[in-house]
Amino acid sequence: HTAAQDNCTCPTNKMTVCSPDGPGGRCQCRALGSGMAVDCSTLTSKCLLLKARMSAPKNARTLVRPSEHALVDNDGLYDPDCDPEGRFKARQCNQTSVCWCVNSVGVRRTDKGDLSLRCDELVRTHHILIDLRHRPTAGAFNHSDLDAELRRLFRERYRLHPKFVAAVHYEQPTIQIELRQNTSQKAAGDVDIGDAAYYFERDIKGESLFQGRGGLDLRVRGEPLQVERTLIYYLDEIPPKFSMKRLTA
């Protein structure tokens, strides 16, 4: 990959192994766990990142596992099945043959079942709401400055097209970032909102996926923006199918 420079590293994904074994001896970076070659000029898919995270040997781990109190998607970390495009397979199963259906960001959207469970299609998550609470500051941030800084972050760091950042809401100390991306809107080469949200989530937790870059240093007009809580909500193009038992629990 040309994006992986002469020193043969992957700037956008530290969970890779890079080697000059590509065509013509060019640098090629493969995701840990899956072995799939990744494009180092853009974000790696969340599925491949999760698989890499679960496969990295303890002694070689470069990323910190979240503490027991960390908020994680639904059922937390699991070793996913990814398709040859690097997307989540619609049906995920664990080692004990318990299966469930997931959406395009890998979050469970049905009750758990057995191997007979069918997941006909990978349902797209088209709306992501990132809910942040920042640490106390002397005063509230200016809303338009905050809006501009977060939009810049998603555009420059995560390479997400600005049109997919639908809105930034702010009521001190809560910040909400809305990402929207329908199937019809996503063109070839566009970063997926699910991938951008995952990179952002890991950045916020101090577990940056970028190679060699410093951690995320968010500042609004020079004032540090320190996040103390993150919740991420996912809305799918087709509503999830959970039993009433779960809904009333």
């Epitope: 990959h1 043969c8 192994v17 080697s19 799939m36 070659a37």
Partner: antibody, heavy 116, light 113 residues
Framework: QVQLVQSGPEVKKPGASVKVSCKAS????????LGWVRQAPGQGLEWMGN????????NYNEKFKGKVTITADTSTSTAYMELSSLRSEDTAVYFC?????????WGQGTLVTVSS | DIVMTQSPDSLAVSLGERATINCKSS????????????LAWYQQKPGQPPKLLIY???TRESGVPDRFSGSGSGTDFTLTISSLQAEDVAVYYC?????????FGQGTKLEIK
């Protein structure tokens, strides 16, 4: 030039273990994936797993997990593939190979025979 | 796992004639990030290790005669020997190195008619 030289043939009894070596030369050992492939008599090729010696990352084919252990010694540019709890079905030629899009480099193969 | 299926299992072709071996994968081997097909073709003669002929579905390894060519994309691939020579008698394998575990086709035995 790139060369992978494997250890000689082995005859083992059922239940024993065997360790096959693969000495690499002619390239930077730590910069390339090195894989192991099995070929039972008259059969096809099966990928067993690989190792990236530079960072000791290892991948195993599920089929061989618990049966095979892949290691590498960077000081001698040598990779190893150990088979445990040998059975007659493990009788095969085992190849090491440098992996990659255009890495057509294979060891000569090591015949492991399991017989009582 | 990706399943690689070759056809035919065996093939007899006259010297100087064209030989065609097909390989079908159960999942696409095209990497959308770099538009590379992660498929290789190997030739194996008795008592020898496999020899790489083609990588990336269609790129000939250096030193391989130009009568060998590879084509195809996604899930369907073909190895063609344009004019069979006596030294081409061997077993031919396709291999996916797109995603772990890497898998091989069952092999095609090529003989002279």
């Amino acid at each position: 030039q790139v060369q992978l030289v494997q250890s000689g043939p082995e005859v083992k009894k059922p239940g024993a273990s065997v360790k096959v070596s693969c000495k690499a030369s002619g390239y930077t050992f730590t910069e390339y994936w090195l894989g192991w492939v099995r070929q039972a008599p008259g059969q096809g090729l099966e990928w067993m797993g690989n190792i990236f010696p530079g960072s000791a990352y290892i991948n195993y084919n599920e089929k061989f997990k618990g049966k095979v252990t892949i290691t590498a010694d960077t000081s001698t540019s040598t990779a190893y593939m150990e088979l445990s709890s040998l059975r007659s079905e493990d009788t095969a030629v085992y190849f090491c190979a440098r992996e990659g899009s255009n890495s057509g480099y294979w060891g000569q193969g090591t015949l492991v025979t399991v017989s009582s | 796992d990706i399943v690689m299926t070759q056809s035919p299992d065996s093939l007899a072709v006259s010297l100087g004639e064209r030989a065609t071996i097909n390989c079908k994968s159960s999942q696409s081997l095209l990497n959308s990030g770099n538009q590379q097909n992660y498929l290789a073709w190997y030739q194996q003669k008795p008592g020898q290790p496999p020899k790489l002929l083609i990588y990336g579905a269609s790129t000939r390894e250096s030193g391989v005669p130009d009568r060998f060519s590879g084509s195809g994309s996604g899930t369907d691939f073909t190895l063609t020997i344009s004019s069979l020579q006596a030294e081409d008698v061997a077993v031919y394998y396709c291999q996916s190195d797109h995603i772990y575990p890497y898998t091989f086709g069952q092999g095609t035995k090529l003989e002279i008619k």
